[in-house]
Every structure is written in C-alpha cells, then in structure tokens.
C-alpha cells in the first residue's frame, strides 16, 4: 500500500513543496516519485518513507508516488494546484470628455490568473460595484454601459480582479487597473466678454480680461488668450459657474500696427470665441552711445543721444540744440569721470499724450596708479614693541597691486598687524603697479627705543 502526504496542495506559481511518499511494507524493492518537476530527495532513516522537495511549480501537476513491495506494486497521487494573479488588468481607454446623457461603454480585459474558478472580474465607479462576473476566456472580458450624469464629473472608473483562495485557507488577492477619470461638461452658446486697451505701446504691458458665465464644470474650462500669434498667460479666477481670466500683454516693435486679440473658451470638444482689435504703436527708449565704454584718462569721449524721429531729447538735463531727436556732448576723461552716468531723456507725443523714455550709460575710466601722502604717509614713527598696522592705499582703475620693499628685499606687511622691532626701521620703496603703469613712493619707518630711567 503506497500513501502520499500531503494529498492536496495549493501553492504560488514558481513555488516549492515537500512531498512524502510512504509504503506499508518494511523492505520495498522500490519507492519513488514520478513527476516532470525538478525534485530533490531529502535523506531520512529507514526504507519505507521518502521526502522530496519539488521546486519551480509553474502549473497544476499530479506527482505520483510508487512502491514495489513483495505483495505487489501500488501508487498514490498528490494534487498540486498553482495559483497566480492576473498579469494584466486593463480598462479600455475612455474618451476624455463626455456630454451629460451619453451612454458610455466600459470594457475590462484580464490576462492570466489561476485558478480561474476562483477568479472574478468587477467593474467599479469609485468604490461602487457596477458589474461582477467570473473570469471566462483568455483574455477574459467584462463590459457594462453607464448613462453619463452631471454628478459623474471627475468620477474614477476602474476594473478589479478578485482571486479568492480563502476556502483553501489562503487570502483574497486583488488586482486593480489604472483608473480612468470621466469629465463631463456644459458650454453656453453665448460668446465670452473681452475687455482690453484699444491702443498699446511697444515694449510696455497692457491688461486683458476675458469672462464667461453658465459653464460646467467651470474649473475645467480652458481659456486661450492671444494677441496675433502671441499666446498670453492669464490668471483665472473662478465663480460657481463663471470665470474671469486676466493677462498681461507685452508687445514688440514687430507687432506694430493693428493686431487681433482673441479669447477662446474650450470645454470638452466645444469652444466659444470673441475677437477684438488693438492698435500697437512704437516708441523705443533713446540710445546713449559712448565712443568707447572704457577709456584711459585724458581720452576724448563723445556721448551721443539718439531717439525716435518725432521725439525731443535732453542729455544730462540739457535739451538738444536745436530741439529734436539728437544730442551730443564732448569731454576729456578724468579719474572723476569713472562710473559717471550719462542720461538721455526723450519725449514723444502720441494721441495728445506725452510719453517719456530714459536711458543711462556708465563710463569706465582707466587711470593711475596713484600713491599720495593722504593714503600712503611718507613717514611713520612707532614705539618699539608696539602693535602697529602699516597702511598704504594705492588708487587707480584697475586697482593696482602694491609692494613696499626695504633694500629691494624686505617687505613691509601692509594692512597686517605687526610687532614693531628694530628690523622694521628703514626706508621702503613702495611700488604700485597696474596695466595702466607704475608709480613709486618712499616710506620711512622710524622706531622709538623705550626710555629707561
């Protein structure tokens, strides 16, 4: 008599199981297991019992234990049932937008999963079950029809599979598809209202407002504002069933002339549009031209101011002579001119309104280096052993590098706190150097010895 344990097993796909084959006779001629599965025998004492590890179980299988005893041969089967959740649970794509009242078909496809007898497909709206059916066929397909309502807006539809292995002592395995969100809409027949300036200056900003009532759902409405080919980026404020879209519009010289301002409202697959014209005029800022923005000290510099042909300009507060769109001044660059601003102001009359524009340019003057008594004293007298900080500031643009050397070799630590010793005494040659040249200055350090009374 051959027996097997366990006689029935449910296990996950790819799993392993221990199967014991036993025989009632003490000295069987043969005791083993017949199976296509990978097996490994575990060594046990005695001859009438063998334990096998069966691994990588991919599908249902019926391994058979057999034994050959003096009184004959016998067999016993164990039933291995493999379970696995579906490999694909998918809801067929839904059109994004649906008008209220339309019938919508939901279709769910399920691939794989076993055992099929324990597999159920459920169609849901949110957590509400719309339909529940056993999984049949490969792939299994379940469909249902929904009448779209206003309150369905934003509802999530999904498909779920349930592999119920609780009767076998396991759990309920659930797989859920990616949700599909339904969007419903109502767009009124009236066009949007558009408020904007009728004229707009090049290189300035204007404000455009577009609004519409009677929308559902108002938060899902797309508003497209455009001036000619230029898309605007509005800030949208919502009411219960209305919106107001506000945008800044910037225009360039290329937009000069009459432009079409458009406001389009798109909801679902419908749209409403309003058109208006805007006149754009040009008045660029005046141009300040320096012969060179960076010059050496003593260089002649011409500063020119040029503006719109119909404008009148002033340069550094002095009106053009004669009054018109051009002005200029001449100067010889001095160190004091370094960083000096040259400002041009232009005035243009547009439709009876005076418009002002300014532009400023800065002059950089390269000069120096300079070493003078005020910033680099020629004489220091310090008490011996006192703490002192030698100071010597070189001026120039670019800022010069400075070195002070005694006998061409001993540096004076400029800007550092030093303890005054006899070694510090002497005459130092301070040399300031930059790309603009080099200057030298002698600095004498005297050290006063302490008096002993």
């Amino acid at each position: 008599q051959t027996s097997v344990s366990p006689s029935k097993v449910i296990l996950p796909r790819g799993g392993s199981v221990l199967v014991t084959c036993s025989t009632s006779c003490d000295q069987p001629k043969l005791l083993g297991i017949e199976t296509p599965l990978p097996k490994k025998e575990l060594l046990l004492p005695g001859n009438n019992r063998k334990v096998y590890e069966l691994s990588n179980v991919q599908e249902d299988s019926q391994p058979m234990c057999y034994s050959n005893c003096p009184d004959g041969q016998s067999t016993a089967k164990t039933f291995l049932t493999v379970y696995w959740t579906p490999e694909r649970v998918e809801l067929a794509p839904l059109p994004s937008w649906q008008p209220v009242g339309k019938n919508l078909t939901l279709r769910c496809q399920v691939e794989g999963g076993a055992p099929r007898a324990n597999l159920t497909v459920v169609l849901l709206r949110g957590e509400k079950e719309l339909k529940r059916e056993p999984a049949v066929g490969e792939p299994a397909e379940v469909t249902t029809t929904v009448l779209v309502r206003r309150d369905h807006h934003g509802a999530n539809f999904s498909c779920r599979t349930e592999l119920d292995l609780r009767p076998q002592g396991l759990e309920l395995f659930e797989n859920t598809s990616a949700p599909y969100q339904l969007q419903t809409f109502v767009l009124p027949a009236t066009p949007p209202q558009l408020v904007s300036p009728r004229v707009l200056e090049v290189d300035t900003q204007g404000t455009v407002v577009c609004s519409l009532d009677g929308l559902f759902p108002v938060s899902e409405a797309q508003v497209h504002l455009a001036l000619g080919d230029q898309r605007l980026n509005p800030t949208v404020t919502y009411g219960n069933d209305s919106f107001s879209a506000k945008a800044s519009v910037s225009v360039t010289a290329e937009d000069e002339g009459t432009q079409r301002l458009t406001c389009a409202v798109i909801l679902g697959n419908q749209s409403q549009e309003t058109l208006q014209t805007v006149t754009i005029y040009s008045f660029p800022a005046p141009n300040v031209i320096l012969t060179k923005p960076e010059v050496s000290e003593g260089t002649e510099v011409t500063v020119k101011c040029e503006a719109h042909p119909r404008a009148k300009v002033t340069l550094n507060g002095v009106p053009a002579q004669p009054l018109g769109p051009r002005a200029q001044l001449l100067l010889k660059a001095t160190p004091e001119d370094n960083g000096r601003s040259f400002s041009c102001s232009a005035t243009l009359e547009v439709a009876g309104q005076l418009i002002h524009k300014n532009q400023t340019r800065e002059l950089r003057v390269l000069y120096g280096p300079r070493l003078d008594e005020r910033d680099c004293p020629g004489n220091w007298t310090w008490p011996e052993n006192s703490q002192q900080t030698p100071m010597c500031q070189a001026w120039g643009n670019p800022l010069p590098e400075l070195k002070c050397l005694k006998d061409g070799t001993f540096p004076l630590p400029i800007g550092e706190s030093v303890t005054v010793t006899r070694d510090l005494e002497g005459t130092y040659l301070c040399r300031a150097r930059s790309t603009q040249g080099e200057v030298t200055r002698k600095v004498t350090v005297n050290v006063l010895s302490p008096r002993y009374e």
């Epitope: 050397l405 005694k406 006998d407 061409g408 070799t409 001993f410 630590p413």
Partner: antibody, heavy 117, light 110 residues
Framework: QSVEESGGGLVKPGGTLTLTCTVS????????MGWVRQAPGKGLEYIGI?????STYYASWAKGRFTISKTSTTVDLKITSPTTEDTATYFC???????FGDGYRLWGPGTLVTVSS | AYDMTQTPASVEVAVGGTVTIKCQAS??????LLWYQQKLGQRPSLLIY???KLASGVPSRFKGSGSGTEFTLTISGVQSDDAATYYC????????????FGGGTEVVVK
C-alpha cells in the same frame, strides 16, 4: 629682462671660485639679487642676497664661506675653500618680492660647479 | 630663524585627482610666500605669489592658500604635465635664515 650666470666648471677643493651673474633690462640699483643652489638630485638651497643698496644678507650656514658683491650690471658670488659638498647648479635670481606675478620668472638657467680633486 | 618645513616629501596621484602640499614657516611670514614648480633639468618656475595669487599663464587648477605660518598648495584635476617637484619659499626675511625654501615635494602622476 633677463639674468645669466657664468664661471661654473671644475674646481679643486680649497681653491677659490667666482661666479658672475649678468643682468639686462633692469637696474641693480632698484632691485635685489640673490643666489640659490641645487645639489644633484637635491632641493633648492638659499645662499644669500644683495640688496639694492649693496647690503648683503646670507643664510646662517653660508656666512663666511660665500661673498656676494655687485657692479652696475653684474652680481658676483665668491666661494671660498669649496668642498665636494658645494658641487651644485648655482642660480642667480632677481628678488622674488619685487615680483607682481606677471610672468616673472627671473631665474638664470644656472651654472654647474663641480668640486673635485 | 625664518625657515620652511614642507610635507609630504613625495606624493603619488592619478590623473584627474587632487594633490595637497603643506608648507609651515617657523615664524609669522604674513602672506609673503611663493610656490615654484621645477621639472627635471629645468630652472624653477613661479606658480603662486603672495600665498594665493596666480602668476600669469598658470592654470587655475593651481590654488594657494594660508597666511602667517601655515600654507597650502592644492592642484585639482591633476594632469600628467603636472609631474614635477614643487617648492615653497618664504620671501619675508632675507636675513636670519637657514633655508628660505621648503624641502620640496615630488608629485608623481599615475
């Protein structure tokens, strides 16, 4: 601006050797000049310096053995009683602290002194 | 005495790596420190002056730092051409000196 050493070569121990550094492109009345040596396979060793005034300053180990002097365009290094340990390449160098880092590398190419009997 | 101690004596670095060389003065030399590079058979060439200023024509991967008695030369993104011996030199005092130069650091690039 350049500096170049001369006067190197083979000298017997105990003799006297004078190396000369010739400068061009700058005035020795404005700049200090120094001597540095490097024994074969060894590091740089400061010998001493002559200031723009003509005052001399030596490394503690070099006092009495080396003498630095100058004319309007040359700086001399006199080595008294050289030993084999004085075998080295001798460099003439314009004092580094007059440097503003603008590509300043006022070292001569060096002259090799070999002290051997 | 205003003498210099340089560490390490030798260092090995891979191409693209970073090398740090330290130099210590026996007394305060403020920022009066130079760094030189010397390749075999050549005269030394100035890299850094005033402890941290780059001499003209020197690549920015060389960086000097420190003041007083502690100074560092850092070479970042080392290239094979950087294989050389590097020396520090104090330039504060020409008298009261045993050796104004550090002992040197040999940089070997792998």
């Amino acid at each position: 601006q350049s500096v170049e050493e001369s006067g190197g070569g083979l000298v017997k121990p105990g003799g006297t050797l004078t190396l000369t550094c010739t400068v061009s492109g700058f005035s020795l009345s404005s700049y200090a000049m120094g001597w540095v040596r490097q024994a074969p396979g060894k590091g740089l060793e400061y010998i001493g310096i002559i200031g723009s005034s003509g005052s001399t300053y030596y490394a503690s180990w070099a006092k009495g053995r080396f003498t630095i002097s100058k004319t309007s365009t040359t700086v001399d290094l006199k080595i008294t009683s050289p030993t084999t340990e004085d075998t080295a390449t001798y460099f003439c160098v314009r004092d580094p602290y007059d440097s503003f880092g603008d590509g300043y590398r006022l070292w001569g190419p060096g002259t090799l002194v070999t002290v051997s009997s | 005495a205003y003498d210099m101690t340089q560490t390490p004596a030798s260092v090995e670095v891979a191409v693209g790596g970073t090398v740090t060389i330290k130099c210590q003065a026996s007394e305060n030399i403020y920022r009066y420190l130079l760094w030189y590079q010397q390749k075999l058979g050549q005269r030394p060439s100035l890299l850094i002056y005033d402890a941290s200023k780059l001499a003209s024509g020197v690549p920015s991967r060389f960086k000097g730092s420190g003041s007083g008695t502690e100074f560092t030369l850092t070479i970042s993104g080392v290239q094979s051409d950087d294989a050389a011996t590097y020396y520090c030199q104090q330039a504060y005092s020409s008298s009261n000196v045993d050796n104004a130069f550090g002992g040197g650091t040999e940089v070997v690039v792998k």
